[in-house]
């Protein structure tokens, strides 16, 4: 018999995206006569969610049968909640009026917060490869989560990293949020098999964090080391010279032999030997017919790796006085069958 009061018992309700939200509202009286309406927000810009009197509200159902005698429950359920539904909902009693109904009394409001899962973290690395001892940046992004509170951690091979910076946007209130983090990682020679992991924890994930990974193999370049050696003679007039290309990554490699500065042969590394740390080795060899030379020969192994500036190593092959008296062609032979070159680049030659 008290004058009508609008009771919204819950100050706040939290719902997972995709679920239904029940917003409770009760009246203490049937008088004054007039419809109940639900709004999101207050003031002139408020959004009509449900009108007892008229309209079509496909996502809204009333919890009670409103036409049932002595019903004072005007709770509603909103289906398929999304982050865009977040806000404060007001149950408002209107008094019949002419020509328009007049707002009589409003409930205190119920704040609906929507728990939305963050998207799977996407980790991206640097655009260009870097060599060991250099620092590279990895970014991690995730979107669409709510509420705003979120935890992001970085790991490298299971070890937590500390050199990173994280931002959650926007700074103010929003229906959903995004996170962006940049981690700085110092590369080491053994990082070909390494992984960086971005791990995100959020209330919606129930203790099972989301992870995004990136392989350092996409970010690292390990330059090769070259060693040119002469093997024992197969025959008195043949010299066997090998170029050992060691511990390089990635595999793209082109090798050129030069004799006294003139290109003798170019080949592209194909069948490689993979080391435990993920780097590769390759060997090329050259058979030199010493009879063909009257003077000493400088043999140069020149390697262009992953499109970088060529590196080279030279070996001085001494021709004995006896051999200088005879002349013949040079014979070359590769230790491994060459394949078509992977790259054709302009190279700079360095002779050591």
């Amino acid at each position: 018999e008290d004058e009508l009061q609008v009771i919204q018992p819950e100050k706040s309700v939290s719902v997972a995206a995709g679920e239904s939200a029940t917003l409770r509202c009760a009246m203490t009286s049937l008088i004054p006569v007039g419809p109940i309406m639900w709004f999101r927000g207050a003031g002139a810009g408020r959004e009509l969610i449900y009108n007892q009197k008229e309209g079509h509200f496909p996502r809204v159902t009333t919890v009670s049968e409103l036409t049932k005698r002595n019903n004072l429950d005007f709770s509603i359920s909103i289906s398929n909640i999304t982050p865009a539904d977040a806000g404060t909902y007001y149950c408002v009693k209107f008094r019949k009026g002419s020509p328009d109904d007049v707002e009589f009394k409003s409930g205190a409001g119920t704040e609906l917060s929507v728990r939305a899962k963050p998207s799977a973290p996407v980790v991206s690395g640097p655009a260009v490869r870097a060599t060991p001892e250099h620092t590279v940046s990895f970014t991690c992004e995730s979107h669409g989560f709510s509420p705003r509170d979120i935890t992001l951690k970085w790991f490298k091979n299971g070890n937590e990293l500390s050199d990173f910076q994280t931002n959650v946007d926007p700074a103010g209130d929003s229906v959903s949020y995004s996170i962006h983090s940049t981690a700085r990682v110092v590369l080491t020679r053994g990082d070909v098999h390494s992984q960086v992991i971005c791990e995100i924890a959020h209330i919606t994930l129930q203790g099972d964090p989301l992870r995004g990974t990136a392989n350092l193999s996409e970010a690292i370049r390990v330059p090769p080391t070259l060693e040119v050696t002469q093997q024992p003679m197969r025959a008195e007039n043949q010299a066997n010279v090998t170029c050992q290309v060691s511990n390089f990554y990635p595999r793209g490699l082109q090798l050129t032999w030069l004799e006294n500065g003139n290109v003798s042969r170019t080949e592209t590394a194909s069948t490689l030997i993979e080391n435990k740390d993920g780097t590769y080795n390759w060997m090329s060899w050259l058979l030199v017919n010493t009879c063909a030379h009257r003077d000493d020969v400088v043999l140069t192994c020149q390697v262009e790796h992953d499109g970088q500036q060529a590196v080279s190593k030279s070996y001085a092959l001494e021709i004995s006085a006896h051999q200088k008296e005879h002349g013949s062609d040079i014979t070359h032979e590769a230790a491994l069958a060459p394949t078509a070159p992977l790259h054709h680049h302009h190279h700079h030659h360095h002779h050591h």
């Epitope: 008290d2 004058e3 009286s29 049937l30 006569v33 036409t67 019903n71 019949k96």
Partner: antibody, heavy 114, light 111 residues
Amino acid sequence: QVQLKESGPGLVAPSQSLSITCTVSGFSLSSYAIHWVRQPPGKGLEWLGVIWTGGSTIYNSALMSRLNISKDNSKSQVFLKMNSLQTDDTAMYYCARGNYLRYWGQGTLVTVSA
Amino acid sequence: NIVLTQSPASLAVSLGQRATISCRASESVDSYGYSYMHWNQQKPGQPPKLLIYLASDLESGVPARFSGSGSRTDFTLTIDPVEADDAATYYCQQNNDDPWTFGGGTKLEIK
């Protein structure tokens, strides 16, 4: 217990104003609306208007220009003011409580006469 | 304004018999599943007293001899059986629309 008591001038000269006070006890004006109803001698009841708990009012459109209802919650008093009285405003004036007019005062008789 | 027309204006009923009073509204007084029609009893020199609210709900303390029925525009107050104390004027009243309005009254006399 719930009580409502009207107090008025009794006699009012034509074209003058009427002021009636309804003093309530046993409940708070912040919880209940108060309505005003009048009844000319030997005739039926006429609803004049209401003041809701928040202080907003609704008046009978036939009398709206002449009526004013106000209240003082702290004094538990509701006031009816009516101007330009004529002889046909002679009536018993009642205040009543709530949505179904469950509780009434005993009324105060107002006679408009020169 | 909604006009309420009561009939008869007066009636005399023998003690122990049934009294039926009618109230017709100029337009429907139903809204949102309820009929906002109420019945009051007034004895001479006294303020009105609520008997029935929302067309059929009996007010606390009122004898079950009183009952109300009807919807939309046609409503009935029934007193069965009538007792001597029931002699009074009966008013229907609506609050579905502003202004709230009363019927003209029906005077019940007990024979």
